[in-house]
């Protein structure tokens, strides 16, 4: 006879699954905060910086009451994929000045990638509808100057920090509703 069958597969506790996602998101939030501070120290920001290709903000105090898990995870995943693409672009095309942010920028990219995989796993474990494959995004134009790369870095890290900040709050709130 073959080996005895293994224990029955226990369906994961959604709150525990969400908990570990919150921990990863919080950890990435702290990493992003540190890197943004490092960037500000090296290249002080003169005012606010925007990048049209970055996702628009998805959450605010007013949106919290109507949050639904599928919508939050789908939107968060889409936004973080966009930020991952921007971080990759920054590392590749940001210019020599931004090389001073390595290896931290590389670490941030790896952790962002890990969080995205975690979100994908969470969505499949919770049997949420999987989003369609992402259409190929148009390539990002290289910055027009070294200073353009630095301004883009301020916008990307600032936007990512804000997105992660709201993500933690939203995920914590959703956990209480499970």
């Amino acid at each position: 006879p073959g080996p005895p069958p293994g224990p029955p597969r226990v369906s994961p506790d959604p709150r525990a699954e969400l908990d570990s996602t919150v921990l990863l998101t919080r950890s990435l939030l702290a990493d992003t905060r540190q890197l943004a501070a490092q960037l500000r120290d090296k290249f002080p920001a003169d005012g606010d910086h925007n990048l049209d290709s970055l996702p628009t903000l998805a959450m605010s105090a007013g949106a919290l009451g109507a949050l639904q898990l599928p919508g939050v995870l789908t939107r968060l995943r889409a936004d973080l994929l966009s930020y991952l693409r921007h971080v990759q672009w920054l590392r590749r095309a940001g210019g020599s000045s931004l090389k001073t942010l390595e290896p931290e920028l590389g670490t941030l990219q790896a952790r962002l990638d890990r969080l995205l995989r975690r979100l994908q796993l969470l969505m499949s474990r919770l049997a949420l509808p999987q989003p369609p494959p992402d259409p190929p995004a148009p390539p990002l134009a290289p910055p027009s100057s070294a200073w353009g790369g630095i301004r883009a870095a301020h916008a990307i890290l600032g936007g990512l920090h804000l997105t992660l900040d709201w993500a933690v709050r939203g995920l914590l709130l959703l956990k209480t509703r499970l």
Epitope: S60, A61, V168, R169
Partner: antibody
């Protein structure tokens, strides 16, 4: 550098009105929810209310509902607090503060509102 | 009467470790992030800890936060004279649909 600068405080009689302003600079104002908080002389901090980044949603503390209104003008990077039917117990330093998630990460220096006859 | 409960005062000598507690309920601390603010005499409050235990840029790691159930605490190690201030805990309250604060703890460095 993020800066928040309140103005418009002063002495007002009970039942009167006052409008406070908060001028923001150093960040993309239209991306952030903004709050008003207050602190009565010698007392603790009290949250007054919040307005969402696009102005579409507002939440208020029970003690100001129907009397205070928060608004914002993103084209002017300015937050407002319209205070009506003021009472002596509304005497406080009023602060504006930025919210990126669940917390207030930057605060203004405050403006004093005194309600007295 | 504040929704969150903090001791009105705390004290310690330079170099000591001091802890300030903050207790609430499931509708605030139990279900939401706890944040701590420091208010030095005559100044506006400043964010000290967010999401229970994260430190904003520029805050020394002598400060730390923790949360368990419906209670949270702020710890300050290697106490310094410049830490003399009022400390407030805060959290969103689901029942009140707003932010609630503790009454504040006045920290004296002896």
């Amino acid at each position: 550098e993020v800066q928040l600068l309140e103005s418009g405080g002063g002495l007002v009689q009970p039942g009167g009105s006052l409008r406070l302003s908060c001028a923001a600079s150093g960040f993309t104002f239209s991306h952030y929810d903004m709050n008003w908080l207050r602190q009565a002389p010698g007392k603790g901090l009290e949250w007054v209310g919040v307005i969402s980044y696009d102005g579409s949603n507002k939440f208020y503390a029970d003690f100001v509902k129907g009397r205070f209104t928060i608004s914002r003008d993103n084209s002017k990077n300015t937050l407002y607090l319209q205070m009506n039917s003021l009472r002596a117990e509304d005497t406080a330093v009023y602060y504006c503060a930025r919210t990126p998630g669940s917390h207030f990460d930057y605060w203004g220096q405050g403006t004093l509102v005194t309600v007295s006859s | 009467q504040s929704v969150l409960t903090q001791p009105p005062s705390a004290s310690g000598t330079p170099g000591q470790r001091v802890t300030i507690s903050c207790s609430g309920s499931s509708s605030n601390i139990g279900n939401n992030a706890v944040n701590w603010y420091q208010q030095l005499p005559g100044t506006a409050p400043k964010l000290l800890i967010y999401y229970d235990d994260l430190l904003p840029s520029g805050v020394p790691d002598r400060f730390s936060g923790s949360k368990s159930g419906t209670s949270a605490s702020l710890a300050i190690s290697g106490l310094r004279s410049e830490d003399e201030a009022d400390y407030y805990c805060a959290a969103w309250d689901d029942s009140l649909n707003g932010v609630v604060f503790g009454g504040g703890t006045k920290l004296t460095v002896l």
